[in-house]
Interface confidence: low
């Protein structure tokens, strides 16, 4: 049986080596001569030679300093022999434990460690954490118990102590009130980590804190009062800009400004916030009026796109705007006129007054009016009253000029400022119509087949309006009914159909045909007849010499 | 005791108005941003409007944008929704709640506003 | 904008643990560490239990317990009991005027 008492080794270990260990013993060296030998790790492989047995004694030997970080535990195995070289035991396993000593000093993971929080944090409010590791034996010694502080901070304000670190787990929390972003923004702590709990080796490392911005600042107008002009009418004109400051992180929305005007209830003006320089861009959003308020005294009140993180006032600035006057066009009344008239209406008759009023109220101001557009040439204008009357009769049948029974004239009035401003006005003369026009027929020339002539309709027109229309009246006269036949083809009479009595020699005919419209207003028209060599529907054809239609009765 | 007790809650018919009150106690009102937040029956909870402590500053959910606004009386420790143009989908329980690095905390119990012809 | 995604419902058995996770987008959850959890029993007032990702308000059991990862975040509540059983939203500050999203909510039943 073998004797082999527990191995234990310290790490690098002073020489002189080869350093006696232990002495392997079997117990069969009673019976005879004993030679030992190892075999593994460290003895006959890598790394070849740390470990040396005398080969009569047994006494285990090594050679060199040892490196517990490196290589922990060695297992060799012990061999017996007899002088013959039989083994006289089985191999044992022989573990030769490296026990450590504190030659490593803590490591952080990082060099520099970053973390952040807000500003305004309360104590107790978890930073960030740093770790730093230790290779030395953490299980059966202090050699590798780290424990975390912080060695300095800079800035030392407005504490010299803002933050603590949990000795144990390296975290890093806030202590004291008064993180301000806007002061302090940033704190590099220098952090130690010890081992030995604390007492051993040491080393350092870097957290650096970021202050994170929290809505602590309200924009600040500077300066507090604004003055500014625009001219009447025009919308979307800036007319002064708003200056702030906000101490706050720039373009966060604790920075953004939003401008609101506290007495604005017309909703006349309009603040838009500059996103490059937080700037408020004050604008009209509608046209102001001079005649109306030569001066308006804006208050602004500024915010962040934000709630404010704490009470805080808000800034106010006051903004003086003068509203310049402009010279304005003078303006009809009504813009567009509606006049009705009878087309009959006298030549040189006043047909009514179309007068513009003058915007301008501080001027005294003369108007002239003149007329802009008419076609027809029917309308004249007193160029100081404005009293609009006839230089021609009207026509509402003047097809040209009137549409739907309107005639439509362009009026303009001028005043005498500087510059001169025109305002246009339109009337509108709905002409009554009146019974001046007796119907007419549509088609006047007409063709019939000699053979088989096929019977042909005649339109009534009349350019008039009812009553002054159909029913229409149609007669035949001068001898014409002799020849022909007309008959009404419709229940209003607007159309009849002409056809002849009997057979027609080929030739031209006139045939006279008296037209009556319901208002009894009539007029005799020539029709143009022509009967042509042909069966049926007739369509043109030559002429022949005329035939009086009173000639053929 | 930090306490929001809302009340005005109750039957209105669409397009009608309310106005909710909600008396806040046990804390320094004027340095909380305050929100309401509602709850429609058997949904879930949705932000309406909030307000800056000093009350210069208003924000309101698109739902409710212009038909809602949210005001405050410091002095009286007290917040205000006024609702015109009511409409069926405003039916719910509305909160009022303080409003802090942004969470709501604490909570009133609730007024009912149903709005039905 | 549309509210944060929570799952409509989650169970788990007394002593166990459960997740009830809360998604957005990078202009709220993912750009703020401004994300809270509330209770809400039937019939009640919502509860804030976390502020900030996981800060829990005093007098709220660290059972209950937050987290973010990008546009994410998280309420874990470890050893479930009884009366945790109720409805949980979250909420998020947001960039522009919609000023706080909420979740759509989340009802937990301990079974």
């Known amino acids: 049986d073998w004797v082999i008492p527990p191995i234990s080794c310290p790490e690098n270990e002073k020489g002189p080596f080869p350093k006696n260990l232990v002495q392997i013993k079997s117990n069969k060296d009673k019976e005879g001569k004993v030679f030992y030998s190892i075999t593994g790790q460290g003895a006959d492989t890598p790394p070849v030679g740390v470990f040396i047995i005398e080969r009569e004694t047994g006494w285990l030997k090594v050679t060199e300093p040892l490196d517990r970080e490196r290589i922990a535990t060695y297992t060799l195995f012990s061999h017996a022999v007899s002088s013959n070289g039989n083994a006289v035991e089985d191999p044992m396993e022989i573990l030769i434990t490296v026990t450590d000593q504190n030659d490593n000093k803590p490591e952080f993971t990082q060099e520099v460690f970053k973390g952040s929080v807000m500003e305004g944090a309360l104590p107790g409010t978890s930073v960030m954490e740093v770790t730093a590791t230790d290779a030395d034996d953490d299980v059966n010694t202090y050699n590798a118990a780290i424990a975390y502080t912080i060695l300095s901070q800079d800035p030392e304000l407005p504490d010299k102590n803002m933050f603590t670190i949990n000795r144990n787990t390296g975290v890093i929390s806030v202590v004291t009130t008064g993180l301000d972003r806007e002061s302090f923004p940033t704190y590099t702590l220098v952090v130690q980590a010890a081992d030995l709990q604390g007492e051993g080796l040491s080393t350092t490392a870097t957290a650096v804190i970021t202050v994170t911005d929290t809505n602590d600042n309200p924009p600040i107008f500077n300066p507090t009062t604004y003055k500014g002009q625009v001219p009447e009418n025009e919308a979307n004109v800036v007319i002064t800009t708003l200056k702030v400051t906000d101490a706050d992180a720039p373009n966060t929305p604790a920075w953004e400004a939003v401008y609101t005007i506290l007495n604005d209830d017309g909703g006349q003006f309009v603040v838009t916030t500059n996103p490059v320089n937080n700037d408020g861009i004050l604008k009209t959003a509608k046209g102001l009026d001079f005649e109306a308020k030569q001066q308006y005294i804006l208050h602004v009140a500024v915010t962040n796109v934000v709630p404010f993180e704490v009470s805080l006032t808000t800034s106010t600035a006051t903004v003086t705007v003068d509203v310049l006057d402009v010279n304005e066009a003078p303006i009809f009344v009504p813009p567009e006129k509606r006049v009705e008239v009878s087309e009959d209406f006298g030549v040189g008759q006043e047909i009514t007054s179309y007068t513009a009023q003058e915007p301008d109220t501080f001027m005294e101001q003369k108007i002239t009016y003149r007329i802009w557009r008419d076609t027809a040439n029917w309308l004249e204008i007193n160029p100081d009253t404005g009293a609009i009357s006839t230089r021609a009769e009207l026509d509402r049948e003047d097809f040209e000029h009137v549409k739907n029974s309107t005639y439509t004239a362009l009026i303009i009035a001028t005043d005498n400022g500087s510059p001169v401003a025109t305002g246009t006005g339109t009337l509108l003369l709905i002409l009554s119509d009146v019974n001046d026009n007796a119907p007419i027929p549509e088609p006047r020339t007409i063709f019939f087949c000699e053979r088989n002539p096929k019977p042909q309709v005649i339109n009534i027109i009349d350019a008039d309006l009812p009553p002054n229309t159909s029913p229409f009246t149609a007669e035949l006269t001068h001898g014409a009914s002799a020849n022909w036949t007309i008959q009404y083809n419709d229940p209003t009479q607007e159309s009849i159909i002409l056809k002849p009595k009997m057979a027609l020699e080929v030739g031209d005919y006139k045939i006279n045909l008296k037209l009556m419209d319901n208002q009894n207003k009539d007029q005799v028209t020539t029709l143009e007849v022509s009967v042509c060599d042909c069966e049926g529907a007739a369509g043109v054809c030559r002429k022949a010499q005329p035939v009086e239609a009173g000639l053929q009765i | 005791e930090v306490q929001l007790l809302e009340s005005g809650g109750g039957l209105v018919q669409p397009g009608g108005s309310l106005r909710l009150s909600c008396a806040a106690s046990?804390?320094?009102?004027?340095?909380?941003?305050m929100s309401w937040v509602r709850q429609a029956p058997g949904k879930g909870l949705e932000w309406v409007s909030a307000?800056?402590?000093?009350?210069?500053?208003?924000y309101y959910a698109d739902s409710v944008k212009g038909r809602f606004t949210i005001s405050r009386d410091n002095s009286k420790n007290t917040l205000y929704l006024q609702m015109n143009s009511l409409r069926a989908e405003d039916t719910a329980v509305y909160y009022c709640?303080?409003?802090?690095?942004?969470?709501?905390?604490?909570w009133g119990q609730g007024t009912m506003v149903t709005v039905s012809s | 904008q549309s509210a944060l995604t929570q799952p409509a419902s989650v169970s788990g058995s007394p002593g166990q643990s459960i997740t009830i996770s809360c998604t957005g987008t990078?202009?709220?959850?993912?750009?703020?560490?401004?994300v809270s959890w509330y209770q809400q029993h039937p019939g009640k007032a919502p509860k804030l239990i976390l502020s900030?990702?996981?800060k829990r308000p005093s007098g709220v059991s660290n059972r209950f317990s937050g987290s973010k990862s990008g546009n994410t975040a998280s309420l874990s509540i470890s050893g479930l009991q009884a009366e945790d059983e109720a409805d949980y939203y979250c909420?998020?500050?947001?960039?522009?005027?919609?000023?706080?999203?909420f979740g759509g909510g989340t009802k937990l039943t301990v079974l």
């Open positions: 709640a303080g409003t802090a690095k942004p969470s709501f905390d604490p």
């Open positions: 046990g804390f320094t009102f004027s340095s909380y941003a």
């Open positions: 307000i800056s402590g000093s009350g210069g500053s208003t």
């Open positions: 990078s202009n709220d959850v993912g750009a703020y560490n401004y």
């Open positions: 900030e990702v996981n």
């Open positions: 909420t998020s500050y947001t960039m522009g005027s919609t000023f706080m999203l």
